[in-house]
């Protein structure tokens, strides 16, 4: 339905608070280096303009598209050329090319300082002094560091952030109340950002067919009692929502997400028995709850799939007449029967089924050709099952830190050209799969583990795309979305890699090591481990373990010393020499 003024339409639908929050997020995700005050000024100008359009939709410029209005506003920033370089060239373009240009310049790894958390009293004072500015600052800081963060979900995080301060700044022990809540929000926020980044990559790099296939599989697992037609409708709507958010159309995205939540709550009976408690909540909470809702129970006595997808005389007719719908039905039927499979595995099975039909429906005897198609699924199912089993055993044996180290070594050997910070970040996150998934019952392990790994590997792909250094990474990232994880799993030691020259500076440590948090210490040690493997890619596990044990002992010794810096200066070169000898 068309509106005379798009900006007025969205302002009325969303309300002033959400409108302003979303515009701030949009601007912060586009211009990630701009100071907070500059963005607030731009948002206020846009909001005042929107209000004039609400009052009179025929007023000047009110008929312009949101991209035109927002792009024009971004292009008024005085320091665009100095701060962003070639991104300023976007402003010479017309819509829709200008918006595409801004999107292409979003930086997944912006050069921004890590956020430092002030003292609790300082934060509480800031919160009480100016709550609105405090919350805007949160939106701004998260959005500029996570340029693909799911905007309506970020509003939900901001609401929780506000609630945490409102509650804890009144508590007797403010820190004990607030810090765990902030830690939880930080960790959940990072996870939410990474999950959304995969959705956007799926849409932008592989197209909406890939995203729709993912959504069919996931929603069929969640809503196994819903009919295919219902799942298809939800998939279409969800695809529109994520296409909009990933494309920077945050107002439309938030509005459509609210409509989807409304539809789901009005049609619970034909979707899932699990939606009830979500639907009693206010909008932001409701949408979040619906997105995270647990799988409904599978209907009893679901018939075998073979009758319709293997034995039927009409398999090739269905494939020829309506390929995507037929494959979608197959995926729906398989997924609703298998909440114990990862979405990526289900998509591989659908791909294998499609490949078989593509080949067999052109054969002399199609039925004879595809009769054993389900047997071909067995190795595809067993591969992730075995991988999860082996890695969970390793995790239980080693614990998280050492499991991360095993993965650091494994991945550095596979792709040693990748930058050390990226290898450390990605391997640490890959290692978190253990604590997250291995404690779960068998039926939940694979979906938890493999779908989480897909999210983490997407981070590697996104960072690598910015500065490509490895053909193997490019190949695994671009050939097939569903086979990314098996592709990385299959990589072996890179024989063509020329070991990195030894640099003593890389292995020189100082007394500041002692004041670091446990996490920061781990990162330092893991950085050294990656550098070690890059220097000696053929080093054995035993050799590396020996060096790392010596490193831990050396750091512990010097951190206990009276003159820590002197200890590091004296013991450091000894450690380096001993390490070189051990790895010779």
């Amino acid at each position: 339905d068309t509106h005379k003024s798009e900006v007025a339409h969205r302002f009325k639908d969303l309300g002033e608070e959400h409108f302003k929050g979303l515009v701030l997020v949009a601007f912060s995700q586009y211009l990630q280096q701009c100071p907070f005050e500059e963005h607030v000024k731009l948002v206020n100008e846009v909001t005042e303009f929107a209000k004039t359009c609400v009052a009179d939709e025929s007023a000047e410029n009110c008929d312009k598209s949101l991209h035109t209005l927002f792009g024009d506003k971004l292009c008024t920033v005085a320091t665009l050329r100095e701060t962003y370089g070639e991104m300023a060239d976007c402003c010479a373009k017309q819509e829709p090319e200008r918006n595409e240009c801004f999107l292409q310049h979003k930086d997944d790894n912006p050069n921004l300082p890590p956020l430092v958390r002030p003292e609790v009293d300082v934060m509480c004072t800031a919160f009480h002094d100016n709550e609105a500015t405090f919350l805007k600052k949160y939106l701004y800081e998260v959005a500029r560091r996570h340029p693909y963060f799911y905007a309506p979900e970020l509003l939900f995080f901001a609401a929780r952030y506000k609630a945490a301060f409102a509650e804890c700044c009144q508590a007797a022990d403010k820190a004990a109340c607030l810090l765990p809540k902030l830690d939880e929000l930080r960790d959940e926020g990072k996870a939410s950002s990474a999950k959304q980044r995969l959705k956007c990559a799926s849409l932008q790099k592989f197209g909406d067919r890939a995203f729709k296939a993912w959504a069919v599989a996931r929603l069929s697992q969640k809503f196994p009692k819903a009919e295919f037609a219902e799942v298809s409708k939800l998939v279409t709507d969800l695809t529109k929502v994520h296409t909009e958010c990933c494309h920077g159309d945050l107002l439309e995205c938030a509005d459509d997400r609210a409509d989807l939540a409304k539809y789901m709550c009005e049609n619970q009976d034909s979707i899932s028995s699990k939606l009830k408690e979500c639907c009693d909540k206010p909008l932001l909470e409701k949408s979040h709850c619906l997105a995270e809702v647990e799988n409904d129970e599978m209907p009893a006595d679901l018939p075998s799939l073979a009758a319709d997808y293997v034995e039927s005389k009409d398999v090739c007719k269905n494939y020829a007449e309506a390929k995507d719908v037929f494959l979608g039905m197959f995926l729906y039927e398989y997924a609703r029967r298998h909440p114990d499979y990862s979405v990526m595995l289900l998509l591989r099975l659908a791909k294998a089924y499609e490949a078989t039909l593509e080949k067999c429906c052109a054969a002399a005897d199609p039925h004879e050709c595809y009769a054993k198609v389900f047997d071909e699924f067995q190795p595809l199912v067993e591969e992730p099952q075995n991988l999860v089993k082996q890695n969970c055993e390793l995790f239980e044996q080693l614990g998280e830190y050492k499991f991360q180290n095993a993965l650091l070594v494994r991945y550095t050997k596979k792709v040693p050209q990748v930058s050390t910070p990226t290898l450390v970040e990605v391997s640490r996150n890959l290692g978190k799969v253990g604590a997250k998934c291995c404690k779960l019952p068998e039926a939940k392990r694979m979906p938890c583990a493999e779908d989480y790994l897909s999210v983490v590997l997407n981070r590697l792909c996104v960072l690598h795309e910015k500065t490509p250094v490895s053909e193997k990474v490019t190949k695994c990232c671009t050939e097939s979305l569903v086979n990314r994880r098996p592709c990385f799993s299959a990589l072996e030691l890179d024989e063509a890699y020329v070991p990195k020259a030894f640099n003593a500076e890389t292995f020189t440590f100082h007394a500041d090591m002692c004041t670091l948090s446990e996490k920061e210490k781990q990162v330092k040690k893991q950085t050294a481990l990656v550098e070690l493997v890059k220097h000696k890619p053929k080093a054995t596990k035993e050799q590396l373990k020996g060096v790392m044990d010596n490193f831990a002992a050396f750091v512990e010794k010097c951190c206990k010393a009276d003159d820590k810096e002197a200890c590091f200066a004296e013991e450091g070169p000894k450690f380096v020499a001993a390490s070189q000898a051990a790895l010779a």
Epitope: F228, A229, A307, D314, K317, N318, E321, A322, M329, E333
Partner: nanobody, 123 residues
């Protein structure tokens, strides 16, 4: 296997209405194409109406605007609402189903059939 049982036939005056039902058992048929065919005495069986998984309906020209096909997947049932009945609508009405994404109009494309229910339109 799918079993189909029709009901709702009977004697009705011209201009009157009837609603035929077809209950499916054996397996859910929400993704199946389903159709109504009819056979008048001494004539070939002919297509009346079909509906696909999306509930998109097609009709024979002779019944367009008078008959409405529908399905209730929760009840695993198919219906045919017949209004403004004419003498030439007299026939045995058969319900049919097949696992097809696009609903066919040809009787030979359907795998499962009911026994039929007689509809007589007469004053």
């Amino acid at each position: 296997q799918v079993q189909l049982v029709e009901s709702g036939g009977g004697l009705v005056k011209p201009g009157g209405s009837l609603r035929l039902s077809c209950a499916a058992s054996g397996r859910p048929v929400s993704n199946y194409a389903a159709a109504w065919f009819r056979q008048a005495p001494g004539k070939e069986r002919e297509f009346v109406s079909a509906i696909n998984w999306q509930k998109t309906a097609t009709y024979a020209d002779s019944v367009k605007g008078r008959f409405t096909i529908s399905r209730d997947n929760a009840k695993n049932s198919l219906y045919l609402q017949m209004n403004s009945l004419r003498a030439e609508d007299t026939a045995v009405y058969y319900c049919a189903a097949v696992f097809r994404v696009v609903a066919p109009k040809t009787q030979y494309d359907y795998d499962y059939w009911g026994q039929g229910t007689l509809v007589t339109v007469s004053s």
